[in-house]
Every structure is written in C-alpha cells, then in structure tokens.
C-alpha cells in the first residue's frame, strides 16, 4: 500500500500504525481498531475511521461526540462492524444485542430491533447535503469565489471527483454543499461522497484525520471562512424505514 517511504506514515489517515513489514519491505499501514490494511493514497472509509476512533484509549481520545446540531446522525458514536472492504455492514448491533440497519455512511435507517432484525442490503446514500453557517464577516463572500474554493477543497484535499460536487448554494451566512453519487456513477478508485463528507466534517471541527498536515485553513480571496455550525443531511437511494411513532415524534 502506498505510504511515505521515508518515515513510513499514512498521509491520509493518522489513525493508523505503519510499519515497513509489507510485501518486499514496503510500508504497510493498518487502521487502529480493525487492523485492516489501508491505502494511504486515498481516503480511508468512514467505517474504519469510526472503528479506529472507538478503539483509541479513553484518556487519549481528543475527539468529541457529535454536537447537538447533528439532526440526522443523532445516535452518536458507536463501534461499527465493517466488511472486508472497510464498508459498513448493513446490520449493526451493540453489546446488548440491540440491532439496526444502516446506510452506506453508517447512519441508522430503521428502528432498533433485536438479533432477529434483517438488513438485506447496504443501502447507498447517494445525496449528501452539508449545511454550514459561517461566522459573521464584514460582508458576504462572493458566491462564485466561494463555489470555486469549496470545489477546489473537495478536489484537492479529499480527492473527490468534481462531478460529484453537484452544487454550492450561498445565502449569507448559510452555505450548502450538495454531493451526489449514484451507485452507477461511482467507478473503481473514486472517493465515496460519504467518506469525503466525513473527512470534511472532522476538518471543520478541527479534528483533522490527515497525518501531520495543518488543520483546515479555509479562505475565500484571503478572507478566513470560519464555520460556526454544521448540519449534514443524508438521502438514501431507498427511503428509510422508521415507524410512524418516530416520524411524528
């Protein structure tokens, strides 16, 4: 797996242990928690990152639970089951045998049940809406400059193909980034929009997953773009199945 050969680290994932014990003495990096080998030339899957996050010693964890604003992913952190490719398994269960179905970004999409709960397939999240509010500035950002800067960010920092950034909307102080990626559109080697959104979310919170890189310094024409709150909405290819009780709550 690609990794910086000189000091054997994983540029795209600091939640790894890297050692020169790969084939031919090459650097090999394994995700904390799962021990799965990761490709350090691209983003690590959200499932492996969550697993690594949960495996970190409690006293060493610098990470916090999702804020009260996370309206959709409101179950907080959990230790997920990942498949051999690092994707979320469709059914997740906790230590007390409570189970639920998740989508491809690991967000619960059914009511919780017991071990008899069936999740026939991993439903793909094909549309992600990232809703940001920026801190007050002297004036509004230029929409086209903001659009260009956010597209550049997703292309260069997260290696997401530009075609998957569907739109950037702006009505001061709210910025909305739309990511769209159908199953049929995603080719081998393409970064998943769910992974890109997760890296972005962690960057925005000042919890960068990149090794040794400075935190995210977002600027539009030299003006700092400082985010004060983030909401992320996930739309699945197949609508979620919640009971009416939850829907009316």
């Amino acid at each position: 797996h690609t990794a910086a050969q000189d000091n054997c680290t994983c540029p795209t994932n600091k939640m790894t242990v890297c050692s020169p014990d790969g084939p031919g003495g090459r650097c090999q990096c394994r995700a904390l928690g799962s021990g799965m080998a990761v490709d350090c030339s691209t983003l690590t899957s959200k499932c492996l990152l969550l697993k690594a996050r949960m495996s970190a010693p409690k006293n060493a964890r610098t990470l916090v639970r999702p804020s009260e604003h996370a309206l959709v992913d409101n179950d907080g952190l959990y230790d997920p089951d990942c498949d051999p490719e690092g994707r979320f398994k469709a059914r997740q269960c906790n230590q007390t045998s409570v189970c639920w179905c998740v989508n491809s970004v690991g967000v619960r999409r059914t009511d919780k049940g017991d071990l008899s709960l069936r999740c026939d397939e991993l439903v793909r999240t094909h549309h992600i809406l990232i809703d940001l509010r920026h801190r007050p500035t002297a004036g509004a950002f230029n929409h086209s400059d903001l659009d260009a800067e956010l597209r550049r960010l997703f292309r260069e920092r997260y290696r997401l193909h530009p075609k998957f950034v569907a739109a950037v909307h702006y009505e001061q102080p709210t910025i909305q980034i739309e990511l769209r990626q159908n199953t049929s559109q995603k080719a081998a080697g393409d970064v998943d929009i769910g992974d890109a959104a997760y890296y972005f979310e962690r960057d925005i919170k000042g919890e960068s997953l990149f090794q040794g890189r400075g935190g995210l310094d977002l600027r539009v024409r030299g003006e700092p773009l400082q985010v004060e709150r983030t909401l992320i909405y996930y739309l699945d290819e197949i609508p979620p199945k919640f009971s009416m009780k939850r829907l009316t709550a």
Epitope: V17, P20, G22, G24, L32, G35, M36, D83, P84
Partner: antibody, heavy 117, light 107 residues
Framework: EVQLVQSGAEVKKPGASVKVSCKAS????????INWVRQAPGQGLEWMGN????????NYNQKFKDRVTMTRDTSTSTVYMELSSLRSEDTAVYYC??????????WGQGTLVTVSS | EIVLTQSPATLSLSPGERATLSCRAS??????IAWYQQKPGQAPRLLIE???ESISGIPARFSGSGSGTDFTLTISSLEPEDFAVYYC?????????FGGGTKVEIK
C-alpha cells in the same frame, strides 16, 4: 540472522501473574510487530495480541484484553507479555513471533507456563 | 472475528502421495492467508504467505492457492519429514486467527 529468544519455563499458582520475555536480534527491533501466540497441550494456535515496538501500540485479542499486558524495552530489544489472574486453562506454550509481509515469519522457541495449585 | 475452518482434521497418506489441505474463511479476506507447519515440540514454521507466495528455503513441493474465502495448501509428493500439523492463519484484520489445524499422518 533473525533470532527471538524467550525466557525459561515457569510454574505458577492460580491467581498469580507471569511475565514472559522475548529478546530480538538480527533486525531493526522497532520496525516489526511482535505477536504473542499460545498453544495449550494438544491444542491449536491462539493469537493473544501484538505490540509495535516503535511506538508501543498494542492490540489485544478480546479474550485476553483484561488480563494481558504487552510492553517493550527498546534499549535491550526485548518485548514482554504479562498474563495475570492465571487459571489452569492458561497452561500452555507461549510463543513470540516477529511479523512481516502479512505472516509470522520468525518464532521464539516457546515458553512453557504451567498453572497448578 | 474471522473464523478459519480447516478440513479435513486428519489426513492419512503414504509418502509420495499428494496432500490437499483446505482452509475456509468466514468472510472474504482476499489473499491475506499464510500456512504453517508444526512438528511436535517445535515452533510453527512459515511455508506460504499471501495465499500462494512461497517462502525462501521451503521446498518447492509446498504450494498454496485460493483467494476470497477458499484456500488450499498442496504438498505435491509427501516426504517422510512432511508428516506434521498444518495451520492456516489470516492477517486481513485483528484479531488475527488460526484455523484448527490439519494433521497429516502416515497411513
């Protein structure tokens, strides 16, 4: 030549702890994972966990998580495996093994730990 | 955790015969499998890594194949010193796990 030399056999009483050492030579000690594998009499191989000597990152098999501690001393290129609250079923040969290229390439000679009252 | 199931548990063969040992993983592990030989009173010895890559110093009669969930160790023509227990082991993810072993005994 890569060598892993383990400490000698131990006899312990139930409830006690045992600390087995594994001294590495012939390669860069900090560059390769050291794993611990045990084998009860007449049984198969069981992975207990591993340690990466460069930064002391440890990863334990859930079965032993509350009882096992792996440490290292880079000055002597030695890794230690301590198992506490011993019971009779912990009677086994304990092996350390250097891991590279996705396999346990080099093994220590094994340390027999007998737990008996 | 990934469970490895080896079969048969015992294989009774004569020197010169071909031995075929199987190892099945509970989920797809690509080629992250290794094979070991263990003789009584000795530590295991690595024979094959990455499912099919031979280790220097290991006789050419030992070969491995397979990927995904089904793996095979083949000993093309058994020598007297090959009668031992053979284990498969996965390194796809932690916890690393071993199969229960296959004992190759003299018929």
């Amino acid at each position: 030549e890569v060598q892993l030399v383990q400490s000698g056999a131990e006899v312990k009483k139930p409830g006690a702890s045992v600390k087995v050492s594994c001294k590495a030579s012939g390669y860069t000690f900090t560059s390769y994972w050291i794993n611990w594998v045990r084998q009860a009499p007449g049984q198969g191989l069981e992975w207990m966990g591993n340690i990466y000597p460069s930064n002391s990152y440890t990863n334990y098999n859930q079965k032993f998580k509350d009882r096992v501690t792996m440490t290292r001393d880079t000055s002597t290129s030695t890794v230690y495996m301590e198992l506490s609250s011993l019971r009779s079923e912990d009677t086994a040969v304990y092996y350390c093994s250097s891991y590279r290229s996705d396999a346990f390439a080099y093994w220590g000679q094994g340390t027999l730990v007998t737990v008996s009252s | 955790e990934i469970v490895l199931t080896q079969s048969p548990a015992t294989l009774s063969l004569s020197p010169g015969e071909r031995a075929t040992l199987s190892c099945r993983a509970s989920q797809n592990i690509g080629t992250s499998i290794a094979w070991y030989q263990q003789k009584p009173g000795q530590a295991p010895r690595l024979l094959i890594e990455f499912a099919s890559e031979s280790i220097s110093g290991i006789p050419a009669r030992f070969s491995g194949s397979g990927s995904g969930t089904d793996f095979t160790l083949t000993i093309s023509s058994l020598e007297p010193e090959d009668f031992a227990v053979y284990y498969c082991q996965q390194s796809n993810s932690w916890p690393f796990t071993f199969g229960g072993g296959t004992k190759v005994e003299i018929k």
